[in-house]
């Protein structure tokens, strides 16, 4: 299996944005790569977002995706937006080298993203 590295822990910003790098050790010269972000919480795994891209080009997520990203060589910089405290969990980076054959699959150990909802601003008495 292809090795995929990602940070162990990331803290989301107060605006609910978390970014992390997913790096893969490519055994071949892939031209088309698919990156999927999976969320694992309470032993349930769900797909957060996925994008296919050409090496050297931008990642294209669906318009309604909460993810954006850029690629550079064998690194993918992923950003997940709109996160709330309930979204805290393990976010796993899955990389597939699709074309040309052969196919390679790599799954990272996951990045624990902590999301803390901002405290509401107290009402001001003037």
């Amino acid at each position: 299996a292809m090795h995929v590295a990602q940070p162990a822990v990331v803290l989301a910003s107060s605006r609910g944005i978390a970014s992390f790098v997913c790096e893969y050790a490519s055994p071949g010269k892939a031209t088309e790569v698919r990156v999927t972000v999976l969320r694992q919480a309470d032993s349930q795994v769900t797909e957060v977002c996925a994008a296919t891209y050409m090496m050297g080009n931008e990642l294209t997520f669906l318009d309604d995706s909460i993810c954006t990203g850029t690629s550079s060589g064998n690194q993918v910089n992923l950003t997940i937006q709109g996160l709330r405290a309930m979204d805290t969990g393990l976010y796993i980076c899955k990389v597939e080298l699709m074309y040309p054959p052969p196919y390679y699959l790599g799954i990272g150990n996951g990045t624990q993203i902590y999301v803390i909802d901002p405290e509401p601003c107290p009402d001001s008495d003037f």
Epitope: T52, P102, Y103
Partner: antibody, heavy 118, light 107 residues
Framework: EVQLVESGGGLVKPGGSLRLSCAAS????????MAWVRQAPGKGLEWVSF????????YYADTETGRFTISRDNAKNSLYLQMNSLRAEDTAVYYC???????????WGQGTTVTVSS | DIQMTQSPSSLSASVGDRVTITCRAS??????LNWYQQKPGKVPKLLIY???RLHSGVPSRFSGSGSGTDFTLTISSLQPEDVATYFC?????????FGGGTKVEIK
Amino acid sequence: EVQLVESGGGLVKPGGSLRLSCAASGFTFSDYGMAWVRQAPGKGLEWVSFISNLAYSVYYADTETGRFTISRDNAKNSLYLQMNSLRAEDTAVYYCARSGLPYAMDYWGQGTTVTVSS
Amino acid sequence: DIQMTQSPSSLSASVGDRVTITCRASQDISNYLNWYQQKPGKVPKLLIYYISRLHSGVPSRFSGSGSGTDFTLTISSLQPEDVATYFCQQGRMLPWTFGGGTKVEIK
């Protein structure tokens, strides 16, 4: 039910051109790579070309590189093969096939016959 | 290119017989080996992919095995509807290549 229907074959003189089409239905076309495979009369199967689901990746057999162009229109659920500078050895039944992992052709159309002859 | 060599090129067997077709790749193709069935005058159909996984709707009398460069398609009990030409195909590297085919007939 997965259905692939080819059209566009016919008789053409050497050096001529043809454009094959393949209309797909019964599955989400934009989720799958597609391939063209041909079979000369009484012969075996020969892979011709492949295009990935979003058309990011396109590949051809060596003998077709520069002469054939594969393309797709995901909005129309259609696959195409533009064939130029046709030769007698291109005479065959051309099949369009759906291609998912592991680089296998899991569903095939009924084929369209291309005859190159003077 | 990876060459795929099938043997035998043709065979004749009785209904109920166990039939074995072999396919040899010119280099290691890992598990990217697929088998197709083409009945006379018909379109090829995927039988087996990833060496041994049956495609949907394929009877369990068909099975595949092998690894690396040597692979086998087995029909455990030949039926009249199995009369066809069988092709192996490698998906390990481009160009994807097929074996020459094995024509199976009933005695």
